[in-house]
């Protein structure tokens, strides 16, 4: 009886510790609003445990509900810079597969130089997340100012 | 065979439920930009389960990847207050041991009175996190306006 | 001996995967500052696994420490809109039972059009969370701009 109970418990590998924290690599060419990310211990404090990068975009490897978070700071920015070049907007969404394309999280900078937010969302294996920065302002590449990550929360 | 499978599973104590949510105690003397935190059920809704406070700074007790989050609101603040006393910046970082000193998260207030953000970061046992508020504005001590916390996420 | 060790492990159902992510349904009548939420796969990417909705407010079903997060964006808003109608404030709190009534998280919009934050807080079975938006501005109902969620973190 006690043995059967042990069988109900959760194997370590099924806990789905999938998690990633990325730093900005570069912006796209003019007509491409996507931010391109990079991660790995050689780069500092960024990492990928489960998800992968596909041409700078984050691809999910395990179905589940994820906490998605992001912070983007505009480079050498003041509130006048931000208002001068308004509207500058950041959107995080599933960009592929196309059939699942949707915006998950959207924020405008208005007179601020940083946006930061987070949300819970279901993601499926193969979903690729894109972060689109619309407007003409260059984001900061400082690793404590601009980052993007996901954390698997439950099946 | 089924017994061997049970052995792969995760012991409760290794789940590492380390978590802390702190409220502002006080600011430092003039030349010390650090915020000093406090936590515990006697104080309200703040708590420490695993991490500890060392002279108002948060010390980590378990290696792992943590979600670090913070919100700081400036006291009796309006957008004119904030812009008048610009730059006011909040930085969260590892301040000791000195060999691991690094800024993890940084935000400026610009014309706003509140900053809030979160990120995933690897932390090691013994890391002490400091939150530096640069500028001359006093932060609110209201527990729903200013708080700082960490949550262990995975090994 | 090894069998006893297996017994220390955590049954799946006690992991308490309670989690919810909600989208805005509607605002209350004039004298009611509460936001009314909705969730469920039929509505898009919102869901409730454990917690329930009670007349548009989120009710907790499991004791524990929760990560509470929220983002609210004001409808058709610019920084001038926001400053013109100041103060607009968002507060998340326990509104029932009355004996546990408390504000957990509070933010003002000032010259911005979006607030976003998160915090760890202990919640008990039966706690109902209310989100109060004071001021005269209407929040956006876009699901990527306004959302509210909780995630069970530990007992």
């Amino acid at each position: 009886q006690r043995f059967a109970q042990a069988q109900q418990q959760l194997p370590l590998e099924s806990l789905g510790w999938d998690v990633a924290e990325l730093q900005l690599n570069h912006t796209g060419p003019q007509q491409d609003p996507r931010l391109y990310w990079q991660g790995g211990p050689a780069l500092g404090r960024s990492f990928l445990h489960g998800p992968e990068l596909d041409k700078g975009q984050l691809r999910i490897h395990r179905d589940g509900i994820y906490m998605v978070h992001i912070q983007v700071t505009l480079a050498i920015c003041s509130s006048t810079t931000a208002s001068r070049h308004h509207p500058t907007t950041l959107a995080v969404g599933i960009c592929s597969p196309a059939s699942r394309s949707i915006s998950l999280l959207r924020l405008s900078f208005h007179q601020g130089c940083t946006i930061a937010s987070q949300r819970l969302t279901p993601l499926a294996r193969g979903d690729t997340l894109c972060t689109n920065l619309t407007g003409t302002l260059l984001p900061s590449r400082n690793t404590d100012e601009t980052f993007f990550g996901v954390q698997w929360v439950r099946p | 065979q089924r017994f061997a499978q049970a052995q792969q599973q995760l012991p409760l104590e290794s789940l590492g439920w380390d978590v802390a949510e702190l409220q502002l105690n006080h600011t430092g003397p003039q030349q010390d930009p650090r915020l000093y935190w406090q936590g515990g059920p006697a104080l309200g809704r703040s708590f420490l389960h695993g991490p500890e406070l060392d002279k108002g700074q948060l010390r980590i007790h378990r290696d792992g990847i943590y979600m670090v989050h913070i919100q700081v609101t400036l006291a009796i603040c309006s957008s004119t207050t904030a812009s008048r006393h610009h730059p006011t910046t909040l930085a969260v970082g590892i301040c000791s041991p000195a060999s691991r000193s690094i800024s993890l998260l940084r935000l400026s207030f610009h014309q706003g009175c509140t900053i809030a953000s979160q990120r995933l970061t690897p932390l090691a046992r013994g890391d002490t996190l400091c939150t530096n508020l640069t500028g001359t504005l006093l932060p609110s001590r209201n527990t729903d306006e200013t708080f700082f916390g960490v949550q262990w996420v995975r090994p | 001996q090894r069998f006893a060790q297996a017994q220390q492990q955590l049954p799946l159902e006690s992991l308490g995967w309670d989690v919810a992510e909600l989208q805005l349904n509607h605002t209350g009548p004039q004298q009611d500052p509460r936001l009314y939420w909705q969730g469920g796969p039929a509505l898009g990417r919102s869901f409730l696994h454990g917690p329930e909705l009670d007349k548009g407010q989120l009710r907790i079903h499991r004791d524990g420490i929760y990560m509470v997060h929220i983002q609210v964006t004001l409808a058709i808003c610019s920084s001038t809109t926001a400053s013109r109608h100041h103060p607009t404030t968002l507060a998340v709190g326990i509104c029932s039972p009355a004996s546990r009534s408390i504000s957990l998280l509070r933010l003002s919009f000032h010259q911005g059009c979006t607030i976003a934050s998160q915090r760890l807080t202990p919640l008990a079975r039966g706690d109902t969370l209310c989100t109060n938006l004071t001021g005269t501005l209407l929040p956006s109902r876009n699901t990527d701009e306004t959302f509210f969620g909780v995630q069970w973190v530990r007992p």
């Epitope: 260059l138 984001p139 590449r141 | - | -």
Partner: antibody, heavy 120, light 111 residues
């Protein structure tokens, strides 16, 4: 293609004002900022000021009291006016477009320049 | 104001060789993970032409013979191999803060 065409006088009397019009094509003034720079043998290249896509301006503190930059988006024209010119204001005056990134102040397309001599 | 000092004031380089021009800023022009230093080429009777922005990014249409590097206060523009059409004056410009300032220029002559 992107072009900036300048028109303005070549000779200005001392203490008088200088007005130059920069007419742009191939891009919109509602998207890009336009800078003004002058070049003289004695002082090299000097940045004078900028008008941003939203119409606000920033000026070099050395010229702020006598410089004015404005624009008409619908006509794709930027207007430069400097008052109280003296002999040491003799230079070639350029308008130039800011690159795509609004917070990186570099100039990717330049007007042909207006050679201005201040003399009586 | 940030002062930019270019060196040498002039140099002569043989066809096919490397030309290296330096620019030193009176304070760091680094911010937000970038170096806010740009390079221009100006030929006689023409306006300046942008070659490099943000220290190392090649402007569209500029040959890969041109490259920029550096950070903080010290920057270099390299041209290799030098061609006859590269005879011009080269200027650095910072945009770390206002006012923008330019270096005094380096005149490149092809031997």
């Amino acid at each position: 293609q992107v072009q900036l065409q300048q028109s303005g006088p070549g000779l200005v009397q001392p203490s008088q004002s200088l007005s130059i019009t920069c007419t742009v094509s191939g891009f919109s003034l509602t998207t890009y900022a336009v800078h003004w720079v002058r070049q003289s043998p004695g002082k090299g290249l000097e940045w004078l000021g900028v008008i941003w896509s939203v119409g606000s301006t920033d000026y070099n503190a050395a010229f702020i009291s006598r410089l004015s930059i404005s624009k008409d988006n619908s006509k794709s024209q930027v207007f430069f006016k400097m008052n109280s010119l003296q002999a040491d204001d003799t230079a070639i005056y350029y308008c130039a477009r800011n690159i795509y990134y609004g917070n990186v102040y570099a100039m990717d397309y330049w007007g042909q320049g207006t050679s201005v001599t201040v003399s009586s | 104001d940030i002062v930019l000092t270019q060196s040498p004031a002039s140099l002569a380089v043989s066809l096919g060789q490397r030309a290296t021009i330096s620019c030193r800023a009176s304070k760091s022009v680094d911010a937000s993970g970038y170096s806010f230093m740009h390079w221009y080429q100006q030929k006689a009777g023409q306006p300046p032409k942008l070659l490099i922005y943000l220290a190392s990014n090649l402007e569209s249409g500029v040959p890969a013979r041109f490259s920029g590097r550096g950070s903080g206060t010290d920057f270099t523009l390299n041209i290799h191999p030098v061609e006859e059409g590269d005879a011009a004056t080269y200027y650095c410009q910072h945009s770390r803060e206002l006012p923008l300032t330019f270096g005094a220029g380096t005149k490149l002559e092809i031997k």
